[in-house]
C-alpha cells in the first residue's frame, strides 16, 4: 500500500528511464547509407519507451546521458568475403539537427562479419541518431544478429 | 517537494536493481552445447543480486527490461585456428519456459578468438537464459576473458 | 529502520549515478603500457560525473557495482597489420591500491583492428582503473573510435 502511494507521487516515467531497442527494417535507397529501424512488441522483442522513430531513424525525447549500443551482422559473409569487400564500416551519429551533427561510434568489419559496441554519450531532446553502413555488404535482418538501442542513464 | 515525499517511501530494493555477473564453470556434458556458469564473491568478482543459478543457467526473478551482456574468449586460439574450426557460434537465448524459447543474441567467431556484445531485452520472472557455444573450440575460464551478466534497467 | 530513514532524505544525486566517459589523451612513455585518458565538455563529448582522473587514470569515488566499457581502435591497421603484430592485447584492471590489483577485462586484436567490450564489476571508492595496451601498434585518438567509461549501476 505504501509502495503504491509512493508510485502515485513519482510516476515511473518521471525517473527518466527512456529506453529503446530496435530491429533492422531495411537498408536505404541508392546512395543513402543509413539503416532504417523498426520497433514495437508486434514485431518481436523490440520496443520504444520514450524515444520515437522518425522515418526509421531514432529520435530522442529526453535530455540526458545515454548508453548507446549496436550490433550489426553482415548477411552473406565469411572472413574472406569481409576482407575482399573491405572497407565496410558502421558509424552511429547524431544526424539532426545539423548543428549537432557528430559521429559517436565507428567500427570497421575487417575480416569479421559482426561488429558490436556501446558507449555513453550526452543526447538532447530532438537529437536524431543515424546508423550509416558504408560498403557493398548487406546487413542481416535477424533480430538476434542486428539491433540498435539506447538507454537513458542519468540527467 | 512531492518528489522528496515519493523518495521517502521507496526502499532501494523496490527500484528493482536486479543484477548478476557470472564466470564460466564448465562446458556441457555429451552433446549439450550450453555453457555452465557460476557466481558468488567466494569465486572472485562474480555475483548474483536477484537472479539465481539453476544447474548453471541464469534464472530471472523480476519482470522488466534487462541489459544482457556476454564475452567469450576461446582458450587455444589464433586467427588461423578460429578460421579452421569455423563455424564457432555463441548464442544467448531464453531456453525455458519452452513457450518463451527464443534466441536473443548470436555471434560467430570467424577469424577472431573473442566475441563480446550486449543488448536490451524484456525478460519475465522465471525465464532461464542459456548460452550455447557450438563448434569444436573450447572457452577460456579466465574471469577477465569469459563472463556473462544481466542488469535490470526498467519495468 | 535506520536504512528507511536514510532513504527518506536521499536527493537524486545520492542515488549514486556516478558516470564517466573518457577519450584517449596519449599513450604512456617508454615501458609504460597504460593509456592516458582525458574528459570534459571542453574536449568534446567526454565527461566525469563523480569519478575523477588521476594522471590520466580513472579513479572511482563511490562504492558499488559498475558497468565498465571500452572500445579501442588501432590507428594504422589492416587485418594483415594486426595479425603481423600479434599479440596486441588490451587489459582493463584495478591498478591501485595494490592490494586490490586485478585484471577485469582482457581482449586480443588477432586479425581485427578494434576491440569493444563491457562488464559488470564491483568497485570501491579509491580504486584506480588502468587500461594497458601491449604490443607495437598505436591506438587511434578519434573520439568515435577509442573511448573508455564507467557507469554506477547499484550499491
Amino acid at each position: 500500500q505504501r509502495f503504491a502511494q509512493a508510485q502515485q507521487q513519482l510516476p515511473l516515467e518521471s525517473l527518466g528511464w527512456d529506453v529503446a531497442e530496435l530491429q533492422l527494417n531495411h537498408t536505404g535507397p541508392q546512395q543513402d547509407p543509413r539503416l532504417y529501424w523498426q520497433g514495437g512488441p508486434a514485431l518481436g522483442r523490440s520496443f520504444l519507451h520514450g524515444p520515437e522513430l522518425d522515418k526509421g531513424q531514432l529520435r530522442i525525447h529526453r535530455d540526458g546521458i545515454y548508453m548507446v549500443h549496436i550490433q550489426v551482422t553482415l548477411a552473406i559473409c565469411s572472413s574472406t568475403t569481409a576482407s575482399r569487400h573491405h572497407p565496410t564500416t558502421l558509424a552511429v551519429g547524431i544526424c539532426s539537427p545539423a548543428s549537432r551533427s557528430i559521429s559517436l561510434l565507428r567500427l570497421s568489419f575487417h575480416q569479421g562479419c559482426t561488429i558490436a559496441s556501446q558507449r555513453l554519450t550526452p543526447l538532447a531532446r530532438g537529437d536524431t541518431l543515424c546508423t550509416n553502413l558504408t560498403g557493398t555488404l548487406l546487413p542481416s535482418r535477424n533480430t538476434d544478429e542486428t539491433f540498435f538501442g539506447v538507454q537513458w542513464v542519468r540527467p | 517537494q512531492r518528489f522528496a515525499q515519493a523518495q521517502q517511501q521507496l526502499p532501494l530494493e523496490s527500484l528493482g536493481w536486479d543484477v548478476a555477473e557470472l564466470q564460466l564453470n564448465h562446458t556441457g556434458p555429451q552433446q549439450d552445447p550450453r555453457l555452465y556458469w557460476q557466481g558468488g564473491p567466494a569465486l572472485g568478482r562474480s555475483f548474483l543480486h536477484g537472479p539465481e543459478l539453476d544447474k548453471g543457467q541464469l534464472r530471472i526473478h523480476r519482470d522488466g527490461i534487462y541489459m544482457v551482456h556476454i564475452q567469450v574468449t576461446l582458450a587455444i586460439c589464433s586467427s588461423t585456428t578460429a578460421s579452421r574450426h569455423h563455424p564457432t557460434t555463441l548464442a544467448v537465448g531464453i531456453c525455458s519456459p519452452a513457450s518463451r524459447s527464443i534466441s536473443l543474441l548470436r555471434l560467430s567467431f570467424h577469424q577472431g578468438c573473442t566475441i563480446a556484445s550486449q543488448r536490451l531485452t524484456p525478460l519475465a520472472r522465471g525465464d532461464t537464459l542459456c548460452t550455447n557455444l557450438t563448434g569444436t573450440l573450447l572457452p577460456s575460464r579466465n574471469t577477465d576473458e569469459t563472463f556473462f551478466g544481466v542488469q535490470w534497467v526498467r519495468p | 529502520q535506520r536504512f528507511a530513514q536514510a532513504q527518506q532524505q536521499l536527493p537524486l544525486e545520492s542515488l549514486g549515478w556516478d558516470v564517466a566517459e573518457l577519450q584517449l589523451n596519449h599513450t604512456g612513455p617508454q615501458q609504460d603500457p597504460r593509456l592516458y585518458w582525458q574528459g570534459g565538455p571542453a574536449l568534446g563529448r567526454s565527461f566525469l560525473h563523480g569519478p575523477e582522473l588521476d594522471k590520466g587514470q580513472l579513479r572511482i569515488h563511490r562504492d558499488g557495482i559498475y558497468m565498465v566499457h571500452i572500445q579501442v581502435t588501432l590507428a594504422i591497421c589492416s587485418s594483415t597489420t594486426a595479425s603481423r603484430h600479434h599479440p596486441t592485447t588490451l587489459a582493463v584492471g584495478i591498478c591501485s591500491p595494490a592490494s586490490r590489483s586485478i585484471s577485469l577485462l582482457r581482449l586480443s586484436f588477432h586479425q581485427g583492428c578494434t576491440i569493444a567490450s563491457q562488464r559488470l564489476t564491483p568497485l570501491a571508492r579509491g580504486d584506480t582503473l588502468c587500461t594497458n595496451l601491449t604490443g607495437t601498434l598505436l591506438p587511434s585518438r578519434n573520439t568515435d573510435e577509442t573511448f573508455f567509461g564507467v557507469q554506477w549501476v547499484r550499491p
Epitope: - | 562446458t27 556434458p29 579466465n142 | -
Partner: nanobody, 125 residues
Framework: QVQLVESGGGLVQPGGSLRLSCAAS????????MGWYRQAPGKQRELVAL???????NYADSVKGRFTISRDNAKNTVYLQMNSLKPVDTAVYYC???????????????????WGQGTLVTVSS
C-alpha cells in the same frame, strides 16, 4: 606436463572398424579436454573428435555417426571408436590434450596443447 601415448592404428578394409587409444600420464588433473586430430598426406591437420573434462563431445561433420569418442577416467585413457571406415579416413591420427594450468601467484589459467606422436590408420582394400 602431460605426456600422451597413442596405439591402435593399422590397416583396415573399407567398411571395417578400429579403436584408437590414447593414454595420458603426468599432470593429468590439469587436462581440460582431449581429442583426436588427423592429417592426411598433403593436407592440414584437422579435428576429428573432442571430449571435455565435463564429458562434452564434439565431432567433425565428416565422422558424425561413424566415430565415437569416450574416456576411461580410471585408466586416464581416451578412445576413438571408428566404424564404417572409408579410404578418405586414411591419415596419421594424433591424440591431443588441452591443459589448463594455474599461473603461479595469480588467479589466471594458462592453456597449453600437448600432442602424441601419432598413429597411422590406412583404409584400403
Amino acid at each position: 606436463q602431460v605426456q600422451l601415448v597413442e596405439s591402435g592404428g593399422g590397416l583396415v578394409q573399407p567398411g571395417g572398424s578400429l579403436r584408437l587409444s590414447c593414454a595420458a600420464s603426468g599432470s593429468i588433473f590439469s587436462i581440460y579436454a582431449m581429442g583426436w586430430y588427423r592429417q592426411a598426406p598433403g593436407k592440414q591437420r584437422e579435428l576429428v573428435a573432442l571430449i571435455t573434462n565435463s564429458g562434452g563431445t564434439n565431432y567433425a561433420d565428416s565422422v558424425k555417426g561413424r566415430f565415437t569418442i569416450s574416456r576411461d577416467n580410471a585408466k586416464n585413457t581416451v578412445y576413438l571408436q571408428m566404424n564404417s571406415l572409408k579410404p578418405v579416413d586414411t591419415a596419421v591420427y594424433y591424440c591431443n590434450a588441452v591443459e589448463e594450468e594455474v599461473v603461479a601467484g595469480t588467479d589466471r589459467y594458462r592453456y597449453l596443447e600437448v600432442w602424441g606422436q601419432g598413429t597411422l590408420v590406412t583404409v584400403s582394400s
